[in-house]
Structures are given as C-alpha cells and as structure tokens.
C-alpha cells in the first residue's frame, strides 16, 4: 500500500541536495583556507539532523544549533553588507570589494544559497516532491527557520557601520516583512553598531529621484533611530557604474555622483 504523503504548496527539495551541500562545503574550505578545520561530513550530518524525521512545519532554531556551532565563523564585524530583494548586485559588490561580506559569503550562507529542503515526520526520507510554503503552509519550515537563524546571528555579529543594499525598483523599498526588515534590523546591537547606511539601488536609467525620501525608507530610519542607531542613506543611481568604480576607484568618471 503506498504511504500517504503530505502535499505542500512549495517546491520540493532541490535535486542532488545532499551532494550539493557536501560539495559546497568542500569547495568553501578549499577557497577559504581559514575554514579548513571544518569537517564537511559532520556539517552535512548536522544539517540533515536539523530537519530529517521532523515535521516540516515544526522546525525550531534549536534544531539548527549543532549546525550553527560547526559553522561558527568570524567575519570582520565592520565589513558586513546586508541586502533586501537585490541579492545579485550585493554579491557582485562583495566579489569586487573583497573585504566586505554578505551572509552568502559565509560558510553557512554559501551552503544553503538558493536551495530548498524538507523532510517528513517519522521517516528518514528527504521530500523531493514538495515543501511547505512560508505563506500558504507554515512559517516554521526548514528553509525559513534556517535563514531566520543565520540572519539573526549575522546581524548580531555586526559592528560600527553596517551597510544594507535595498532595491529602489520595488514598491516597498524597505519591507518590514523581508528577512532584513523582520530579523536583521531588530538584531543589530546598538551597543556595537553606530550607523546603518542604506544604499538604495535605482533601476531606471533616467531615474533621478531621491529615493532616500521614500516613505518606507523614512519608516526604516524611524525603526533604526528608536534603537539608538544612527541612519544614513545614499542613492546609487547607476549600479553598473557603481560596480565599475568599486573595481577602478581611480577612474576619472568616478568622482561624480554614481
């Protein structure tokens, strides 16, 4: 008799999930020699242990603690770049500005980036058919809880000036429901973080509006100020030129507004 399987609303576990996590871990330790003490088999075992045989709507941050411990990593606390709804540009930036880090530049973020995973209660199987959707099914699913956990820890580690890249093409440039808005903003430590500097990335070629005056940015400023952290905001009118100038700061065209 075929076992009844829960149908969730979201896509199933990414194919080759175990192989991908293990391969990513090994790659990461190859290109980041300071992390070569990490045992990738133990990392995979801890990752698996966080969600296998557990109901995929009943995952807690506690489930991920063994993995968090194994993936403990020190990044320069004053070189952190947060982002919201503009991941690709943030990653292009840290690829050029090598001394700055997004969450996905750390081992745990790198391992899970763009992957989906979930298991089933009481069976050791990985569910490749479907996984819970955050909105339609439940928020305490393996993927959401993972990102909430690592994002909180990443924000807690930040100090001095923290940068955040925001997508100026979205209707809500700052979204309270994003991971940045719901987790990271609230876990910046006022005793360590002096300033949050937002970079609002413009999408249109001829868009010369000051998006730092957007109501959602004012809302972000209010939240941050109430937490005794200073706030500053910059418009990045030309993201392509911005990246080019990060690459070649001495270029004569890089002295003007970007």
């Amino acid at each position: 008799v075929p076992r009844w399987r829960q149908q969730w609303s979201g896509p199933g576990t990414t194919k080759r999930f175990p192989e991908t996590v293990l391969a990513r871990c090994v790659k990461y330790t190859e290109i980041h020699p300071e992390m070569r003490h990490v045992d990738c088999q133990s990392v995979w075992d801890a990752f698996k242990g966080a969600f296998i045989s557990k109901h995929p709507c009943n995952i807690t941050e506690e489930d991920y603690q063994p993995l968090m411990k194994l993936g403990t990593q020190t990044v320069p606390c004053n070189k952190i770049l947060l982002w919201s709804r503009i991941k690709d540009l943030a990653h292009q930036f840290t690829q050029v500005q090598r001394d700055m880090f997004t969450l996905e530049d750390t081992l745990l973020g790198y391992l899970a980036d763009d992957l989906t995973w979930c298991g089933e209660f009481n069976t050791s199987k990985i569910n490749y058919q479907s996984c819970p959707d955050w909105r339609k099914d439940c928020s305490n699913n393996p993927v959401s809880v993972f990102w909430k956990t690592v994002s909180r820890r990443f924000a807690e580690a930040a100090c001095d000036v923290v940068h955040v890249m925001l997508n100026g093409s979205r209707s809500k440039i700052f979204d309270k429901n994003s991971t940045f808005g719901s987790v990271e903003v609230h876990n910046l430590q006022p005793e360590k973080v002096q300033t949050l500097e937002a970079w609002v990335i413009h999408g249109g070629r001829e868009d010369s509006r000051d998006l730092c005056q957007d109501p959602t940015i004012k809302e972000l400023e209010s939240i941050i100020s109430k937490r005794n952290i200073q706030f500053s905001c910059k418009n990045i009118y030309r993201p392509d030129k911005f990246l080019q100038c990060v690459k070649n700061p001495e270029d004569s065209s890089c002295t003007s507004e970007i």
Epitope: A23, R24, V26, K27, T29, R36, H37, Q95
Partner: antibody, heavy 123, light 112 residues
Framework: QMQLVQSGAEVKKTGSSVKVSCKAS????????MHWVRQAPGQALEWMGW????????DYAQKFQDRVTITADRSMSTAYMELSSLRSEDTAMYYC????????????????WGQGTLVTVSS | DIVMTQTPLSLSVTPGQPASISCQSS???????????LNWYLQKPGQPPQLLIY???TRAAGVPDRFSGSGSGTDFTLKISRVEAEDVGVYYC?????????FGQGTKLEIK
C-alpha cells in the same frame, strides 16, 4: 572517467587577447573549483586564479588581477581563461586543474589537469 | 606570498639508486587542522604535472610506493627509494596553505 580537455594552441599579437577553454567531463562540473596555472618555457608553474562554476565567483593572483578574466558556462561544463594586453612574457603553456576530494576533504593538490594550451605571443 | 625554494635544481641518478629532493617554505605550512599543505608533482616532458604527494606525506592515487614525502612545518623532502627510468622529469613542490598557491622552481631528475 574524469577529463579536462583544453582548446588548441594559439598564436597572438602583442596587445591582443586570448581566450582558452577547458571542457570538463566525467563529474558534476559545478561541484568543483577550477584553477588555472601557467608555465612559461623552461620556467616553474605559476597559479593564475580560480572560479567556482556554480556561483561564477572568482579570485585571481595579484600579478594577473588587471588582465585575467575566468568565466564558466555551466550548460557546456566549460571554464574559460581570458588574458588581455598580451606581451611576449605571456608566451606559455596554460593549464586548467582541479583537486581531488578525499573522504569529503579537498586534498589541496591539483590531481587533475588539462593537457595544456600553448599560447605564443609574437610582435 | 609564501616562497618555495627547492634544492638541488638538478640531479643525476643511477637506476635502482635512491634520490632525494628538498623544499623549503618561507612560512610554516602546518594548518590548525593538523594537515601540512605541501604537495609534490612530477612533470614529464611534454605532459602536464601529475600529483605525487599531498598533505606532505600522502601518496596520490596510483603513485608507486617508492615515492615518499616527509618533513616539518617549513622543511620538506621527497624521496624516491629506487629510481626508475620512468621517473625522469621535473619535480615541483607546492604550498596550498594559503592563496596564492605557490610552486618551487623545480628539480630536474636525469638518469645516469
């Protein structure tokens, strides 16, 4: 079996660019970092840079930073190394290489190499 | 960058006799994980290099047991217990403790 097959020999003029390809087979291309190493005639080996084919992220040796670009085409399981502003000193054999994985640990040694691509730069 | 220095730059050995190549690094290659990131390669004429030894003393797959690697944090030795005709070529040591990975200048082994 695991293979890295490189493009053929090239003769280039000073100041031009060259793009060397390295086609991988026998393994999942995105699971491994690809490195590029060169060797000028009668000289030692010199590491140029790496690419993570899954993400497209790269890192280059300081010496080549301004002139080298390493890319990857996941659909073709192929890595590319482009060197610009060629000078006579760039005449060399160019190799792609990757490590072996020993029980879920990168060995730290280049266990697999392409056959090499000879690039000759003439004025 | 870590500098790798090999000695001798060439040696000529009678078949069946032992051979020894030294390599010195400008910094210790011992990682906190207990592994020493020193590799040895042999490059035969007209071929790409082939990995002989990694982690200072672990033989790569298919490498005959007449090849052995030893050393400490900065001083390393590749030994061939009994040289055979097929061992001719240039031997390179390489550090992979940190980026950029760097190679020694090579030691050419000839048969007498």
């Amino acid at each position: 079996q695991m293979q890295l097959v490189q493009s053929g020999a090239e003769v280039k003029k000073t100041g031009s660019s060259v793009k060397v390809s390295c086609k991988a087979s026998g393994y999942t291309f995105t699971d491994y970092i690809m490195h590029w190493v060169r060797q000028a005639p009668g000289q030692a080996l010199e590491w140029m840079g790496w690419i993570d084919p899954e993400y497209g992220s790269t890192d280059y040796a300081q010496k080549f930073q301004d002139r080298v670009t390493i890319t990857a085409d996941r659909s073709m399981s192929t890595a590319y190394m482009e060197l610009s502003s060629l000078r006579s000193e760039d005449t060399a054999m160019y190799y792609c290489a990757r490590v072996a994985i020993i029980t879920t640990v990168a060995s730290g040694g280049f266990a697999y190499w392409g056959q090499g691509t000879l690039v000759t730069v003439s004025s | 960058d870590i500098v790798m220095t090999q000695t001798p730059l060439s040696l000529s050995v009678t078949p069946g006799q032992p051979a020894s190549i030294s390599c010195q690094s400008s910094e210790s290659l011992l990682h906190s994980n207990g592994k020493t990131y020193l590799n040895w390669y042999l490059q035969k004429p007209g071929q790409p290099p082939q990995l002989l030894i990694y982690w200072m003393s672990t033989r790569a797959a298919g490498v005959p047991d007449r090849f052995s690697g030893s050393g400490s944090g900065t001083d390393f030795t590749l030994k061939i217990s009994r040289v055979e005709a097929e061992d001719v070529g240039v031997y390179y040591c390489q550090q992979f403790l940190e980026y950029p990975p760097t190679f020694g200048q090579g030691t050419k082994l000839e048969i007498k």
